[in-house]
Amino acid sequence: VPRWRQQWSGPGTTKRFPETVLARCVKYTEIHPEMRHVDCQSVWDAFKGAFISKHPCNITEEDYQPLMKLGTQTVPCNKILLWSRIKDLAHQFTQVQRDMFTLEDTLLGYLADDLTWCGEFNTSKINYQSCPDWRKDCSNNPVSVFWKTVSRRFAEAACDVVHVMLNGSRSKIFDKNSTFGSVEVHNLQPEKVQTLEAWVIHGGREDSRDLCQDPTIKELESIISKRNIQFSCKNIYRPDKFLQCVKNPEDSSCTSEI
């Protein structure tokens, strides 16, 4: 007789999730000499321990602490790039500008990027059928709590000038409900962070508006200023040219505004 199973609104655990995490971990530790000491099997054990046999709506940051400890990594605190709703460009940027780091350029962020996972209360089973959706089911689900935990730690580690890439094509360029708006902004440390510099990425070719004047950007400036952190904003009118100029800064066309 099939046992009754909780049906969640979100997609289930990514196929071959354990294998994917292990493979990513090995790849990462081979590429990054400073993480060669990491035992990827221990990392997976800690990852699994955070959500297996637990109710997928009752996950806490505490559940992820063993994993956080194993994945402890020092990135240059003044080379941090945050992003909101524009992940692909942020990653393309750090792939070129190798001395800057997004969360997904760290071991833990790299392991979990684009993956979904959850378990079931009181069974060791991984749920490949469905997982809780943040809006429709619950916010304290394994994936959301993971990203909240690593994002908080990443923001807390930042210093000097912190950059954030924002999507100028969205109706809310700065969204208070995004991970950046709800977690990272509030965990930048004023005693360490001097400035938050926003890069607003334009979508349309002919879009010459100053999106730094957008009401949501002004709201971000207000939040940041109240936290005793300076704020600056730049329009990136041509993201394609922006990336090209990061690759080839000597190019004559890169002196003009991009």
């Epitope: 071959r16 999730f17 354990p18 292990l22 000491h37 990491v38 035992d39 990827c40 099997q41 221990s42 054990d45 699994k48 297996i52 194993l70 069974t123 060791s124 089973k125 991984i126 490949y128």
Partner: antibody, heavy 120, light 111 residues
């Protein structure tokens, strides 16, 4: 050629201790999880313990938990099993096995085994 | 009592096809964990026959094949030969026990 050579077996009294060793050659030892599996006379295979490739994770069968300790020295390409508080039911041939990368994937190379006899 | 259940014995005549079953649960085979199969000839150490459910290591004849469905796995041996007479064990990881588990073994007799 991939080889595993167990040693350290012998006759020991109940309550006594013994340390088994497994010398590995022919592969990158520190890239693979390792396991100990035993077989009592006339019985089937019983998994005893496993250790991850860098030694960060260890696993034990309930029957040996708290009495046996698995460890490895990657600089010496050697796997160990420290056995204490030995009982008559620990009498078996002990095999050292190389795991198929992860401890979760099973064993792809086995040693010839070393015999442990617990008797007064 | 093993966590994985295998028939204690199986038999067949030369040239025949024989299947050995291995039944588990949702905490091991049914939880996306790979199944391996081992052959143990009399008086020798076990040898890996099948890994990752259905993969054959080099040197293992293609007469041996593995499959998995739900919480069970099976080993099929086609074109049975006298040298196939041995004990066969299935194994997998169990997430509830956090341990590797073997089946009780199946003694295959070639008649």
């Amino acid at each position: 050629e991939v080889q595993l050579l167990e040693s350290g077996g012998g006759l020991v009294q109940p309550g006594g201790s013994l340390r088994l060793s497994c010398a590995a050659s022919g592969f990158l030892f520190d890239d693979y999880g390792m396991s100990w599996v035993r077989q009592a006379p006339g019985k089937g295979l019983e998994w005893v313990s496993a250790i991850s490739y860098k030694g960060g994770s260890t696993y034990y069968a309930d029957s040996v938990k708290g009495r046996f300790t698995i460890s490895r020295d990657n600089s010496k390409n050697t796997l160990y099993l420290q056995m204490s508080s030995l009982r008559a039911e620990d009498t078996a041939v002990y095999y050292c096995a190389k795991d198929h990368k992860w401890n979760y994937y099973g064993m792809d190379v086995w040693g010839q085994g070393t015999t442990v006899t617990v008797s007064s | 009592q093993s966590v994985l259940t295998q028939p204690p014995s199986a038999s067949g005549t030369p040239g025949q096809r024989v299947t050995i079953s291995c039944s588990g649960s949702t905490s091991n085979i049914g939880n996306d964990n790979y199944v391996s199969w081992y052959q143990q000839l009399p008086g020798t150490a076990p040898r890996l026959l099948i890994y990752k459910d259905d993969q054959r290591p080099s040197g293992v004849p293609d007469r041996f094949s593995g499959s998995k469905s739900g919480t069970s796995a099976s080993l099929a041996i086609s074109g049975l030969q006298s040298e196939d007479e041995a004990d066969y064990y299935c194994g997998t990881w169990d997430d509830r026990l956090n341990a590797w588990v073997f089946g009780g073994g199946t003694k295959l007799t070639v008649l």
